[in-house]
Interface confidence: low
């Protein structure tokens, strides 16, 4: 049988009673000789093909219990006719056997007289008939075939005889094995009950583990249910808090960069003005009026308009307002608020543990009391009483069997000796026939006359006639033995062995009021004095065969209902009522008004409305109107084209100044522009869809807040119920298992069914009836064939 299933008990949490090992095999293997037994069964089926006569047997048994039987009653006559009809095959065989018994001695006697008067064969002919040799051959072959058939029959007899001896010897061991199994049943049962009780502690430990770790089991369950709706929102807010910090950093960087740029640009502008002034002053040199220097000077004068700083760098709007806004936003510690949110979630298991200390203690008290209740119930089980009574019966039966086994073995020796004599006698007859045939064939001389034939040939004839004589003397005695064993063996096989195997015999015994006219069901009347309770031999035998427990097999629930006494519902109800007082209050903090305002302020801080393109446009432009290095080199080249003197030197000095301006002014501006670009990009990324993001986060926040407001209590209730179901599940499962084990597994009555099988199926049918039937089948066949043998021998 399987385990009782409990929906809430963990699947892996299965109990198993330790297996009880029994010694006795519950089926008997005949071995190769089984083929011979099957042959007899086939013969019996031919002789007796009708189904087991349940009704006839019932009526017969009812008549047998009557004190005085009226044979003239029609129903008695009909019953008699039914018995005759069923036994027709056997009766017919008996009639033929009786004819054989009566006729064989008479025929033998007359044949002997006839032979003595030289009338019945044995006369000597001078000349052979034409068909004489052919007839002789036919007779010899026929006799040989018949002798072989007789020999097979004798072989069957020997085998059967040997089987009886060896099998009866095995009976003692078989009986001991059965009694050992019955003792095992008696001894194991208290151990099984102890084991069942011990499993309560295992169950209780499992529940205690869950109770002790209520923080992770219940708290964790609640947390797992809430997490998916809250953590994503907190994560989003956390990422927004990071974004605010990054924005502040970017704005600060941008601000300082812009300030640097303004200063650097002004300085560049100032420097370029100075150098332009210097160049203009240089170009006032009189040399510039003289050709070809005048062209160079004009070229330089024209190029001066290029020496301008990019004025737009100084016009880039500030980000003070945005930075102020972000700084205001950062006054609220959004990170801290988010952390509070996470913390309030992570605190759930501990809060659950703190709030359930009393309830857990209460449940533990209930669980401890259930243990003692179960102990009381198992103490009162009637299994022990039945087993005690059964123990007495087992002891009596064992001593009875041990007392009578020597007698059985003694009778078996007589049977074996008788069988040996019978088989030996038949063997002697068939040996004479074989010798007669052998001598006849070996000593035959077709030219010799009857008076001059050889000694061997003559001896052959003598052997044949001795065989015939012995056949006439003993075959009728053998047939008596065959008929008697046949009637007994065939009826036992047909009326006990076969219906026992098919359980039809149990159905007869289960007939209401049959074995006791006061009891509807014999077994329940005998065991419990409650004959109305349906307890049948067939059901008890089948249940025991299936290894079912005594409690379930004998329907002990009628005298002690374990379900009522265990009262699963009452126990689980006690746990449930304790669990009902399990109340958990959670305070989950999400963000609060300050946090919400913080997000809204950040959304309104203006970084999404900044004109990033104007900043980015400037980062791509040159700080000066021209590449100052190129301008300086060009100026140097032009200066070099002038004749040596003040003009040339001052121009070269100015070129050098421009290079310095590039180095000291332009390069730092380019560096600042690169920094500005990075800051703008960060801000652009953060500002992109900021309002939508914050709106979405606030919507998620509202959803999460609604979820907490509307669902937290139902989540707690559901998880608490689930937790309760798990705890209760352990005990429901355990109590169902107890019920199942006591009903189906404890004190398995299989040894009883095995003992019955041993007594009927093995001992009676396999050890006695099968060899007995093979014996009469073999000897009967040999005896029957003695008749044609003696005819052909004569």
């Amino acid at each position: 049988g399987g385990q009782p299933s409990s929906t809430d008990a963990p699947k892996a949490w299965n109990y198993e009673l330790p297996a009880t090992n029994y010694e006795t095999q519950d089926s008997h293997k005949a071995g190769p000789i089984g083929i011979l037994f099957e042959l007899v069964h086939i013969f019996l089926y031919v002789v007796q093909p009708r189904d087991f006569p349940e009704d006839t047997l019932r009526k017969f048994l009812q008549k047998a219990y009557e004190s005085k039987i009226d044979y003239d009653k029609p129903e008695t006559v009909i019953l008699g006719l039914k018995i005759v009809y069923y036994e027709a095959g056997i009766i017919l065989c008996c009639v033929l056997g009786l004819l054989f018994i009566i006729l064989m001695p008479l025929v033998g006697y007359f044949f002997c007289m006839c032979r003595c008067c030289n009338k019945c064969g044995g006369e000597m002919h001078q000349r052979q008939k034409e068909n004489g040799p052919f007839l002789r051959k036919c007779f010899a072959i026929s006799l040989l075939v018949i002798c072989i058939i007789i020999s097979i029959g004798i072989f069957y007899g020997f085998v059967a005889n040997h089987q009886v001896r060896t099998r009866i010897k095995r009976s003692r061991k078989l009986a001991d094995s059965n009694f050992k199994d019955l003792r095992t049943l008696l001894n194991e049962t208290p151990e099984q009950i102890k084991y069942i009780l011990a499993q309560y502690n295992t169950t209780k430990d499992k529940a205690f583990t869950d109770l002790n770790s209520i923080n992770s089991v219940l708290g964790g369950g609640i947390l797992d249910r809430l997490r998916p709706n809250i953590i994503p929102v907190l994560d989003e807010i956390k990422s927004m808090a990071t974004a605010i910090k990054e924005t502040k950093e970017a704005l600060e960087n941008m601000n300082s960069t812009l300030k640097s740029l303004h200063q650097q640009s002004t300085q560049l502008s100032s420097s370029l003005t100075s150098v332009k002034t210097s160049l203009r002053s240089s170009l006032n040199d009189p040399l510039c009026l003289v050709h070809p220097s005048s062209e160079t000077c004009n070229s330089i004068r024209l190029s001066l308009s290029q020496l301008n700083s990019n004025p737009e760098l100084r016009q880039l709007p500030p980000v003070d307002a945005e930075l102020d806004n972000v700084n205001n936003v950062l006054r609220t510690d959004l990170d801290g608020l988010v952390q509070q949110g996470y913390q309030s979630l992570n605190d759930i298991p501990d809060r659950v543990q703190r709030q359930t200390t009393t309830v857990v203690a209460g449940i533990k008290r209930v669980l401890n009391s259930i243990g003692s209740d179960i102990d009381n119930v198992t103490q009162r089980l009637p299994i022990q009483d039945i087993l005690s009574a059964f123990s007495v019966y087992v002891n009596n039966t064992e001593s009875y069997i041990h007392r009578n086994l020597p007698t059985l073995e003694e009778y078996d020796s007589y049977w074996w000796l008788g069988g040996l004599v019978i088989c030996s006698l038949l063997t002697l007859i068939v040996i004479f026939y074989y010798l007669g045939l052998l001598c006849g064939v070996c000593g035959y001389d077709r030219h010799a006359t009857p008076t001059t034939r050889g000694c061997v040939s003559n001896t052959g004839g003598v052997f044949l006639m001795v065989g015939v004589g012995l056949s006439f003397l003993f075959c009728w005695i053998l047939m008596i033995i065959v008929v008697l064993t046949f009637v007994f063996g065939a009826n036992v096989e047909k009326l006990i062995c076969e219906p026992y195997t098919s359980k039809e015999l149990f159905r007869v015994l289960d007939t209401p009021y049959l074995l006791n006219e006061d009891w509807e069901y014999y077994l329940s009347g005998k065991l419990f004095n409650k004959s109305k309770m349906k307890l049948t031999f067939e059901q008890v035998y089948s249940d025991c065969k299936k290894n079912r427990g005594t409690y379930g097999t004998l329907h002990l629930q009628n005298s002690f209902n374990i379900s009522e006494h265990l009262n699963i519902n009452e126990h689980t109800g006690s746990i449930s009522s304790e669990l009902e007082s399990l109340k958990v209050n959670l305070n989950i903090f999400l963000l609060g008004a300050a946090g919400r305002k913080n997000l809204q302020d950040f959304a309104a801080c203006g970084i999404d409305r900044m004109n990033y393109d104007s900043y980015l446009a400037q980062t791509g432009k040159s700080p000066a109107g021209v590449n100052l290095l190129s301008f300086a080199y060009d100026l140097e080249a032009k200066a070099n084209s002038l004749p040596p003197g003040n003009l040339r030197n001052s121009l070269k000095r100015d070129a050098q100044t421009i290079k310095t301006i590039h180095q000291q002014r332009v390069l730092p501006i380019e560096q600042s522009l690169s920094t500005l670009y990075q800051s703008v990009k960060i801000l652009q990324r953060t500002g992109n869809g900021l309002l939508e993001r914050v709106t979405r986060i606030l919507a998620s926040l509202d959803f999460a807040q609604n979820f907490i407001t509307n669902n937290t209590s139902s989540v707690i209730i559901e998880e608490t119920k689930k937790y309760g179901r798990t705890i209760i599940g352990y005990f429901e499962h355990y109590l169902q298992w107890i019920e199942f084990s006591i009903s189906e597994k404890v004190a398995s009555c299989k040894p009883v069914a095995t003992a019955l099988d041993t007594a009927v199926d093995v001992f009676l049918c396999s050890y006695i009836i099968d060899p007995l039937n093979l014996f009469w089948f073999g000897i009967g066949k040999a005896t029957v064939f003695l008749l044609p043998a003696l005819i052909f021998a004569v």
Epitope: N255, S256, L258, K259, S260, H262, Q263, T266, Q267, S269, S270, L272, T273, N308, S309, P311, E312, L313, R314, Q315, L316, P317, P318, D320
Partner: antibody, heavy 117, light 106 residues
Framework: EVKLVESGPELKKPGETVKLSCKAS????????MHWVNQAPGKGLKWMGW????????SYADDFKGRFAFSLETSASTAYLQINNLKNEDTATYFC??????????WGQGTTLTVSS | DIVLTQSPAIMSASPGEKVTISCSAS?????MYWYQQKPGQPPRLLIY???NLESGVPARFSGSGSGTDFTLNIHPVEEEDAATYYC?????????FGAGTKLEIK
């Protein structure tokens, strides 16, 4: 709140030297350039020049090169304007102003300098 | 240096009227700034980058223009608006101010 507080009115004789101060508060001093603007009585505003508060490097308008000097005391968040060899035409109100690029967003209350023999 | 010419130099207006002050640059500039100065006080920034209103400045002030011609409008003018108004550029070094327009309220 950003504040620029200038030193009190000054009365000087020609040829003397004066040092006007401008104390900044409410922001990081080195973040903004400091400019000086002059306003002669009944006249318009005239830009004198500026000082890079990060590097301390001054830059002067053409009309104010020579006798005028800008300096800093960064630790005290203070900028100074020193005028040497004062002349009667130096009589004016002197403003310090921080710039945010192309314009002057915060101004000191102004220091009145009177040069008279 | 870029020269800024403001017109008119002096003007008067009654409360509720619309006042327009012009500023003309000697060469093209990208941006223009406007300041208000009351007697005994430092200048106060009104408009930056041609048309942007500085925080705290009433909405009746507005700026417009491009290239060399820029305008400051006050509508409706109020008594407290009596002051001298300056335009300023920093497009080209050095920064320069206009000579100022004095607004009187009748």
């Amino acid at each position: 709140e950003v504040k620029l507080v200038e030193s009190g009115p000054e009365l000087k004789k020609p040829g003397e030297t004066v040092k006007l101060s401008c104390k900044a508060s409410g922001y990081t001093f080195t973040d903004y350039s400091m400019h000086w603007v002059n306003q002669a009585p009944g006249k318009g505003l005239k830009w004198m020049g500026w000082i890079n508060t990060e590097t301390g490097e001054p830059s002067y308008a053409d009309d104010f090169k020579g006798r005028f000097a800008f300096s800093l005391e960064t630790s005290a968040s203070t900028a100074y304007l020193q005028i040497n060899n004062l002349k009667n035409e130096d009589t004016a109100t002197y403003f310090c102003a921080t710039d945010y690029g192309d314009y002057f967003d915060y101004w000191g209350q102004g220091t009145t300098l009177t040069v008279s023999s | 240096d870029i020269v800024l010419t403001q017109s008119p130099a002096i003007m008067s207006a009654s409360p509720g009227e619309k006042v327009t002050i012009s500023c003309s640059a000697s060469s093209s500039v990208s941006y223009m700034y406007w300041y208000q100065q009351k007697p005994g006080q430092p200048p106060r920034l009104l408009i930056y980058l041609v048309s942007n209103l500085e925080s705290g400045v009433p909405a009746r002030f507005s700026g417009s223009g491009s290239g060399t011609d820029f305008t400051l409008n006050i509508h409706p003018v109020e008594e407290e608006d009596a002051a001298t108004y300056y335009c300023q550029q920093y497009h080209s070094y050095p920064p320069t101010f206009g000579a100022g327009t004095k607004l009187e309220i009748k």
